[in-house]
């Protein structure tokens, strides 16, 4: 299929101009290739008429030109002096040659329609009203006024001044005069159809003394907007009803050969093909509103229509607004898991797109709730507080650069599952949806923290260890102190690292974190977690709570006391090197640097990874090492 | 509830610069959208600016276009009006106000221009711009 789009119907009356926009995918090779407008033939030849090499046909001369628009993936051809003759099928395309990338453009020029010479042209879109105005002299005031549309033998009455009104103007035609100027009267006809469309003679007075007016009403269908959009990016129909819908109801549907099934509609309707990723969004007083659908699918190409009616329906006679939607398979969003699945008590770790040229631009994750018109509260940001409900499960990792932000949630529940967006304050079209499926756990987690119910004493040692299995042997470990601005990782000391090792002793994988000397500012959620470079795995999380020490009390958990020991002796050297290093000034390079300097002490590979937030008062040490 | 305190204004002469900035107390800063007022001597207040809670859309007065920028840093609590050439028919109290949004996406691009729409506002701060 071509990526190529434009409009697929042009229509316009003679010596009219017409100004066609075609696009194409966002690539260097396209913005500088040649652009070409060309006629199809009956034997199937396309014939150039104008290229954005300088070509320009003879019957195209001094009445036609194409512009491409890079910055906006896009070409104008405009063409002016529109005769009969241009009617035909055309291509807007892309190549060196006309059989390159392409779009059927059909063009059609009509002949300005005949009218009496009199004849004042109302021209009114679907669903809008129109105010006629009908001019009459002084001695025909008393007389009886009327308008009426004609058909082919004669013109049957609209509404008159004797309040008869056809039946199919009832509720729609009022015929009134202003104020005291008694030579006009006005006809209103709301709720326009395209049955609507034709003459009318507007009358006052009876016999050859009344005074007659032509006119002619022209009802037209919005002219659809064109949206190119990416295979996976989002759009944004931004509806502009006009003030006097504003209190109706609305809706965006999509058009199905002679029906439009509506998407949504702010009566609580939505169609379950856009669960997850649709939002509408009732702006103002003045009728306009915003539908968002993120996750875009080849089959959500087409056209598409929103309106505004207290049954949240399509109806005839009301205003509306369409766009014809292109999406393209070529996209530049990365194809990734639009499901994530998960189980209860564990974690997930969700690589958000976000678009590469963009990297200052503000990252946000929000859970889609499909109540009401819809929402999407957003949960965390890179200058967003988590919220509430969230605290000590949920951060956001900004890799900066390189086109992907993750977002991490632990200690997951069933009520987790559902829809999530990430999106950022930048390119909109970059909003993606994942499905977060959270399943009951069936076996142990893969990283546990011992001791699980941790309660720290100020001024003291106190060391936690994560434990982790083998298939994470090669993966990079780490703790972090959580916050809700983040989660800022601490500097490691790993001990695990061994260049010779073979085999994987399963009990005794751990990465330790000491906290010398504890202070009441430790207080708070742990996290443990693997990453492999900037691709972040599975955490696990816990409180350390502080206390102050009450006489003749031990802190160590009874049962934990032997692992504790153990754990405790092991680190004790490490723990020694590292105070002596963290009385050194640590530079802050930022809360999630992650600068690794390995240094070879015998056969053991130690690994200082300094981080924003690690830094720590003279005399105290935050480290965390690992086996 | 948010108390915003406006700061920066003071005497400048005409084709200057002055930068205001509007401290916001409270956690929930991010779910404000945020705009700037004036109101000269016996005129009525004003519209200047306003900048929707993520800082991705803003909104200016035709008198203001292309010579004020507002913009917000939500890690500061802090919403700012960089005033350059300024004539002295931009001499006024500047008011910061604040209006209640909520961090969703649907008001991601929220901005108005009316007064009624905000909830909270500030004391003000005086600019002064001589010919």
């Known amino acids: 299929k071509s990526p190529i789009f434009g409009p697929q119907e042009v229509s316009s009356i003679e010596g009219d101009s017409v100004s066609i926009t075609c696009y194409y995918p966002d690539t260097s090779v396209n913005r500088h290739t040649r652009k070409y407008w060309c006629r199809q033939g009956a034997s199937g030849m396309c014939t150039t008429l104008i290229s954005s090499n300088g070509y320009l046909s003879k019957e195209y001369s001094g009445r036609a030109n194409l512009i491409n628009f890079p910055e906006n993936n896009t070409f104008v051809i405009n063409i002016e002096q529109l005769t009969q003759d241009d009617t035909g099928s055309y291509k807007c395309g892309l190549g060196t040659s006309n059989r390159g990338l392409s779009f059927d453009v059909s063009l059609e020029v009509s002949q300005v329609p005949e009218l009496p010479s009199d004849t004042h042209v109302y021209t009114k879109d679907i669903g809008r009203n129109v105010t006629i105005e009908c001019p009459f002299k002084r001695e025909n005031a008393p007389s009886k006024k009327s308008l009426c549309k004609k058909t082919n033998q004669s013109c049957e009455l609209v509404i008159d001044s004797t309040e008869k009104v056809n039946p199919s103007y009832i509720g729609r035609a009022k015929l009134f005069m202003k104020g005291t100027d008694l030579t006009v009267f006005y006809v209103n006809i709301s709720h326009l159809t395209h049955n609507d469309a034709g003459l009318y003679i507007c009358q006052a007075g009876e016999g050859p003394s009344a005074d007659k007016k032509n006119v002619d009403l022209q009802v037209l269908a919005p002219e659809p907007e064109l949206l190119y959009k990416d295979l996976r990016s989002s759009v944004t129909f931004e509806c502009d009803l006009g003030r006097e819908v504003a209190n109706e109801a609305k809706y965006l549907c999509r058009m199905n050969k002679e029906t439009c099934d509506v998407i949504i509609n702010t009566l609580g309707k939505r169609d379950p093909d856009f669960e997850g990723r649709i939002l509408i969004t009732p702006k103002d007083d003045n009728g306009r509103f915003s539908v968002l659908i993120t996750g875009l699918r080849k089959e959500d190409a087409g056209h598409y229509q929103c309106g505004a009616h207290s049954s949240g329906l399509p109806q005839e006679g009301w205003p509306i607004q369409t766009w014809q939607l292109f999406v393209n398979e070529e996209s530049t969003i990365p194809n990734r898991r639009s499901v994530v699945k998960g189980v209860t008590g564990g974690s997930v770790a969700i690589a958000c797109p976000y678009n590469p040229k963009e990297s200052s631009s503000l990252k946000y994750w929000c859970r889609w709730e499909g109540d009401g018109n819809g929402h999407c509260p957003v949960l965390v940001g890179t200058q967003a507080q988590v919220q509430e409900e969230y605290e000590g499960r949920l951060a956001l990792f900004d890799q900066p650069g390189n086109g992907t932000y993750t977002v991490i949630l632990n200690q997951l529940t069933t009520e987790d599952a559902g829809f999530y967006w990430c999106l950022t304050n930048g390119d909109s079209r970059w909003r993606t949806t994942i499905e977060l499926q959270v399943a009951e756990a069936t076996r142990e987690p893969n990283l546990e923290v011992t001791p699980q119910n941790a309660t720290a004493v100020l001024g003291e040692t106190f060391t936690v260890s994560c434990h982790y299995p083998c298939k994470f042997y090669s993966q990079e470990k780490y703790w972090c102190k959580w916050s809700n601005k983040g989660c800022h990782i601490l500097p490691s000391h790993d001990e695990g690292a061994r260049q010779s090792s073979v085999s994987c002793d399963q009990s005794s994988q751990l990465v330790s974190m000491t906290l010398n000397p504890v202070s009441k500012e430790d207080e708070g959620w742990y996290w443990c977690g693997v990453k492999q470079g900037q691709t972040y795995g599975e955490t696990t999380a816990i409180y350390i709570a502080v206390e102050e020490r009450t006489r003749g009390s031990s802190h160590v958990n009874p049962t934990d006391a032997n692992a504790r020991a153990k754990v405790a002796l092991e680190e004790e050297v490490v723990d020694s090197s590292i105070s002596e290093k963290e009385n050194k000034a640590i530079p802050n390079p930022g809360p999630f640097a992650n600068e690794r300097e390995i240094q070879n002490v015998g056969d053991q590979a130690q690994e200082n990874r300094a981080s924003g937030d690690a830094g720590s008062a003279d005399g105290q040490s935050r480290s965390s090492s690992s086996k | 509830e948010v108390q915003l305190v406006e700061s920066g204004g003071g005497l400048v002469q005409a084709g200057g610069s002055l930068r205001l900035s509007c401290a916001a107390s409270?956690?929930?800063?991010?779910?404000?959208?945020m705009g700037w007022f004036r109101q000269a001597p016996g005129k009525e207040r004003e519209f200047v600016a306003a900048?929707?809670?993520?800082?991705?859309?803003?909104d200016y007065a035709d008198s203001v276009k292309g010579r004020f920028t507002i913009s917000r840093d939500n890690a500061k609590n802090t919403v700012y009006l960089q005033m350059d050439s300024l004539k002295p028919e931009d001499t006024a109290v500047y008011y910061c106000?604040?209006?209640?949004?909520?961090?969703?996406?649907?008001?991601?691009?929220?901005?108005?221009?009316?007064?009624?729409?905000?909830?909270?506002w500030g004391q003000g701060t005086q600019v002064t711009v001589s010919s």
């Open positions: 106000a604040a209006e209640v949004v909520g961090r969703d996406v649907t008001t991601m691009y929220r901005v108005s221009g009316l007064e009624y729409e905000y909830d909270y």
């Open positions: 900048i929707s809670w993520t800082g991705g859309s803003t």
């Open positions: 409270g956690r929930t800063f991010d779910s404000y959208a």
